[in-house]
């Protein structure tokens, strides 16, 4: 048989080979597509099916208009002036190129050493759905999970039956390298068809600014609560991009989840101890904090904590 | 079918600015990337960048950087590229490609001559 | 930067005849993920502007004539014209695009006997 393949919306016609040029009742066309049930069969004295094929007084089959539920398998017999039967046979396959793919929220600045997110690749009204591909500087960008992670997305309209992709990439770029030209390429995988591309980005890669010191607050001032009372400790840091922040006390990190505010509600004697905060970055490694002494006293004398503690508010610990 | 018209020969001072232009037809201008190559006699072809009209980004060589401006007008299909403050060594003949992102400059500009001479 | 050096920088043959010539590059140009060479032949005819013959190594540009191939991997790539027509007097160059710069070859001047 013969593999075609027809763009959706156009006109197909599948000649019937070995057809006599008056067609009598030695020829019919059999269908097996997502319109027939099982094979339908069309023959030249027969009504035109649904306006969707009928045979040419040549005895080739016209589609006027191919749709997604043409595809399938046709079938021609006729027998030719010597009473010979000949046979054609084809696969029809259809396709619809869509609309330019587009990189939609692009990023403008991405930070070296940390995960971003570049931007999401949308194609819209393809089929089959076909696939989106990634590039770097021109040459593809292969997804590794650490480095290049790139989610993808496919869905189907429920009435057209066209795909719209959606892929996302995120990178974790290099420090010290050249401005990278990133763009998404939408292809189709027919053979002599070029991938459609979108329009290139060009982000600025950023370095991610050291830490300029850590510091602990502390409230109440000094560290010294009654029982029952509530010690809040806030981890401060300028970093770009914002660190990591774990707790640690009398030496144990705590299991909790990252967060720069530490609240201990309701404090009792078992929440003593000291505490500090460590910040982790992706490129300067961790750095913790001065600790502080947390005391629960019953009668509320003012013990001072370790470091230095402001007047009135909260205690401020700096590197 | 696809071309691009160059602009005519330019005979300028040292020190000045040149800008020649490249006019594309045959195709959507803003779907392909427009490369700028030079060639002097005897010193083979070099790269000096790209633009991509359909957003105007830029990608120089680093060795034409502050030497070559790229530009795009949409609206008349058009790319440019200024030369400042242009000595003996940036007389030369000056190529606009265009290139369908990784297949290479597959049509290219008839070429401007620039001179520079006091 | 990628170095590329081709060799003959001239060579004269007679029309019919067999022509090779060489295009080597200070890296490789052979991109893993995809198999590809991001290498390009172009042709320059006298006083004219260049004409993309092949690109990634070894693929014709719609409408060369077949008598032109490219072949060739990694660092060491090769243009063939296997039976020279008097029309191909020209400079041929080869032009690494797998890295910025893009840098091209010095060339090669094909003269007919």
């Known amino acids: 048989g013969q593999n075609i393949t027809a763009r959706i919306g156009e006109p197909l016609m599948l000649s019937c080979k070995g057809a006599p040029k008056k067609p009598t009742q030695k020829l019919e066309w059999k269908l097996n597509t997502g319109r027939t049930e099982a094979w339908k069969v069309l023959s030249p004295q027969g009504d035109p099916w649904d306006s969707v094929a009928r045979i040419l007084p040549n005895g080739s089959l016209l589609l006027p208009a191919i749709g997604i539920v043409d595809e399938g398998t046709f079938r021609c017999r006729a027998t030719n002036r010597l009473g010979k039967e000949v046979k054609s046979n084809y696969r029809v396959r259809v396709y619809q190129i869509p609309g330019k793919p587009e990189i939609v929220n692009p990023a403008s600045e991405l930070t070296a050493n940390v995960p971003n997110k570049v931007g999401t690749c949308v194609s819209e009204g393809s089929y089959p759905a076909g696939t989106l591909s990634w590039h770097l500087d021109g040459k593809p960008l292969i997804p590794d999970g650490k480095g290049t992670v790139v989610k993808e997305e496919t869905r189907r309209h429920p009435e057209t039956g066209l795909f719209t992709l959606r892929s996302e990439l995120t990178v974790t770029p290099a420090q010290g390298g050249t401005t990278p030209t990133y763009s998404c390429s939408f292809s189709l995988g027919l053979p002599r068809r070029r991938p459609l591309n979108t329009a290139p980005i060009q982000p600025r890669v950023r370095e991610p600014l050291p830490p300029e010191g850590i510091q602990l607050l502390v409230e109440p001032e000094g560290g010294t609560v009654a029982p029952g009372g509530t010690v809040t400790l806030t981890c401060a840091i300028s970093a770009q991009p914002p660190p990591q922040i774990h707790w640690i006390k009398d030496g144990t990190p705590l299991p909790l989840a990252p967060s720069p505010v530490l609240l201990l509600p309701e404090v009792g004697h078992e929440d003593e101890g000291i505490y500090s905060c460590v910040a982790t970055h992706p490129s300067h490694g961790p750095q913790e904090s001065p600790p502080v002494n947390i005391r629960v006293t019953e009668t509320g004398d003012e013990g001072q904590a370790a470091g230095s503690v402001d007047g009135s508010g909260l205690g401020t610990l700096a590197l | 079918q696809v071309q691009l018209q160059q602009s005519g020969p330019e005979l300028v001072k040292p020190g000045a600015s040149v800008r020649i232009s490249c006019k594309a037809s045959?195709?959507?201008?803003?779907?392909?990337?427009i490369h700028w190559v030079k060639q002097r006699p005897g010193q083979g072809l070099e790269w000096i960048g790209w633009?991509?009209?359909?957003?105007?980004?830029?990608k120089y060589n680093e060795k034409f950087k502050g030497k070559a401006t790229l530009t795009a007008d949409k609206s008349s299909s058009t790319a440019y590229m200024q030369l400042s403050s242009l000595t003996s060594e940036d007389s030369a003949v000056y190529f606009c490609?265009?290139?369908?992102?990784?297949?290479?400059?597959?049509?290219w500009g008839q070429g401007t001559s620039v001179t520079v001479s006091s | 930067d990628i170095v590329m050096s081709q060799s003959p920088s001239s060579l004269a043959v007679s029309v019919g005849e067999k022509v090779t010539m060489s295009c080597k590059s200070s890296?490789?140009?052979?991109?893993?993920?995809?198999?590809?060479?991001?290498l390009a032949w172009y042709q320059q005819k006298p006083g004219q502007s260049l004409k993309l013959l092949i690109y990634?190594?070894?693929t014709r540009e719609s409408g060369v004539p077949d008598r032109f191939a490219g072949s060739g991997s990694g660092t060491d790539f090769t243009l063939t014209i296997s039976s020279v027509k008097a029309e191909d007097l020209a400079v041929y160059y080869c032009?690494?695009?797998?890295?910025?710069?893009?840098?091209f070859g010095g060339g090669t001047k094909l003269e007919i006997k």
């Open positions: 490609a265009r290139y369908d992102y990784d297949y290479a400059m597959d049509y």
């Open positions: 633009i991509y009209p359909g957003n105007v980004i830029t």
């Open positions: 890296q490789t140009l052979l991109y893993s993920s995809n198999q590809k060479n991001y």
């Open positions: 990634w190594a070894s």
């Open positions: 045959g195709y959507t201008f803003t779907d392909y990337y």
């Open positions: 032009q690494q695009y797998f890295g910025y710069p893009y840098t």
